[in-house]
């Protein structure tokens, strides 16, 4: 049998190398960059995905006002350190020994420091606000239809339980999706809101992480919903610690 015939691939993560060398000749997949085994029946953690991405060849009014403590990922891509479970390590450092603390979605939450910087714990991001602007349409989408479709998307495509989709707000053309998941709410096996948000972000950008599964086909009552810009805000269980210099910049 060829690999194509056996279809030994990871449907949930195209950034993997798979081979039928698992127990009983079963397909086993490892993330690029880290070489860690991944569970292809669910989403791969954002940390492993970022690490794989960095290792890959380079190519090409009802609306919510984010809190003063909301973080936006302004630092962009970096090659993260992941723990054995695939989560971000609380302290991240670059090759020049510059270090910083991150939250559970890998976004910097302190000023940058040196190797003496301590990050005592990985602080959980418990609230994610996804702010979207959709392309012009003939008319506004029906709010309840839009709400149902986005909840369905997070349940069916990203396997995120609907209870973690706290709200969907809409004021044409702005859509806001609120994801909430406290440490106490997240059971073993539940998809993490940070991972679901990252898969969604990549889908919206036309960079789907799914293997072989088509790109995002988002429709509301048959009408395509096309997103032209995305902003994601992250709120941590413990507010971030930045110096006043940054806050006034």
């Amino acid at each position: 049998h060829t690999a194509a015939q056996d279809n030994c691939t990871c449907p949930t993560n195209k950034m993997t190398v798979c081979s039928p060398d698992g127990p009983g000749g079963r397909c086993q997949c490892r993330a690029l960059g880290s070489g860690m085994a991944v569970d292809c029946s669910t989403l791969t953690s954002k940390c492993l995905l970022l690490k794989a991405r960095m290792s890959a060849p380079k190519n090409a009014r009802t609306l919510v006002r984010p809190s003063e403590h909301a973080l936006v990922d302004n630092d962009g891509l970096y090659d993260p350190d992941c723990d054995p479970e695939g989560r971000f390590k609380a302290r991240q450092c670059n090759q020049t020994s510059v270090c910083w603390c991150v939250n559970s979605v890998g976004v910097r939450r302190t000023d940058k420091g040196d190797l003496s910087l301590r990050c005592d714990e990985l602080v959980r991001t418990h609230h994610i606000l996804i702010d979207l602007r959709h392309r012009p349409t003939a008319g506004a989408f029906n709010h309840s239809d839009l709400d149902a479709e986005l909840r369905r998307l997070f349940r069916e495509r990203y396997r995120l339980h609907p209870k973690f989709v706290a709200a969907v707000h809409y004021e044409q053309p702005t859509i806001q999706i609120e994801l909430r998941q406290n440490t106490s709410q997240k059971a073993a096996g539940d998809v993490d809101i940070g991972d679901a948000a990252y898969y969604f972000e990549r889908d919206i950008k036309g960079e789907s992480l799914f293997q072989g599964r088509g790109g995002l086909d988002l429709r509301v009552r048959g009408e395509p919903l096309q997103v032209e810009r995305t902003l994601i805000y992250y709120l941590d269980e413990i507010p971030p610690k930045f110096s006043m210099k940054r806050l006034t910049a």
């Epitope: 029946s41 669910t42 339980h161 998809v191 072989g212 599964r213 088509g214 048959g222």
Partner: antibody, heavy 116, light 108 residues
Framework: QVQLQESGPGLVKPSGTLSLTCAVS?????????WSWVRQPPGKGLEWIGE???????DYFPSLKSRVTISVDKSKNQFSLKLSSVTAADTAVYYC?????????WGQGTLVTVSS | DIVLTQSPGTLSLSPGERATLSCRAS???????LAWYQQKPGQAPRLLIS???SRATGIPDRFSGSGSGTDFTLTISRLEPEDFAVYYC?????????FGQGTKVEIK
Amino acid sequence: QVQLQESGPGLVKPSGTLSLTCAVSGGSISSSNWWSWVRQPPGKGLEWIGEIYHDGSTDYFPSLKSRVTISVDKSKNQFSLKLSSVTAADTAVYYCARDNWGFDYWGQGTLVTVSS
Amino acid sequence: DIVLTQSPGTLSLSPGERATLSCRASQSVSSSYLAWYQQKPGQAPRLLISGASSRATGIPDRFSGSGSGTDFTLTISRLEPEDFAVYYCQQYGSSHRTFGQGTKVEIK
């Protein structure tokens, strides 16, 4: 490799309650998947009955909702189906399945006959 | 609820031929939420395709899926003897999953 195994009585009396259990092995029921029941009357097509998440959240097919209860027992890694007030029309092969971008793992099915 | 209608009801073909099975939805279904199954007599169904076009693990590449909106297609490029079975489409784009009534692919 995830495996599912249905068990329960093969014969139920009319107006009685059909009770089946699905044991999950090779994987945890406390995963991001939903767990479904599907049935197939003799010589007919597939009918979805309903499904459950490990926290006990459920979805049921509307026409069966008033008669169906699906429950989960995480300690035993199993989930169960109860269908009340059964008639001959409920005679079918009953399957349990994992719902993960389609039903990717199925039990072998168990035939339940409703007859006095 | 979304009703799925499969056609034809029966397809009579010879091994080596191409099989084209159709599934039409009563209302638009995102292609992310359509699956195809194969069922042989006395066996449980087997997932072939999810997300309208993504082959499930272990499914040979002669099986392919396509379509969007209300029209979806399962194609078997060259029928092998083991492919003669009943095929079902299924949508999971609403909280209530529904199946088509099935297409039987039989030996001519």
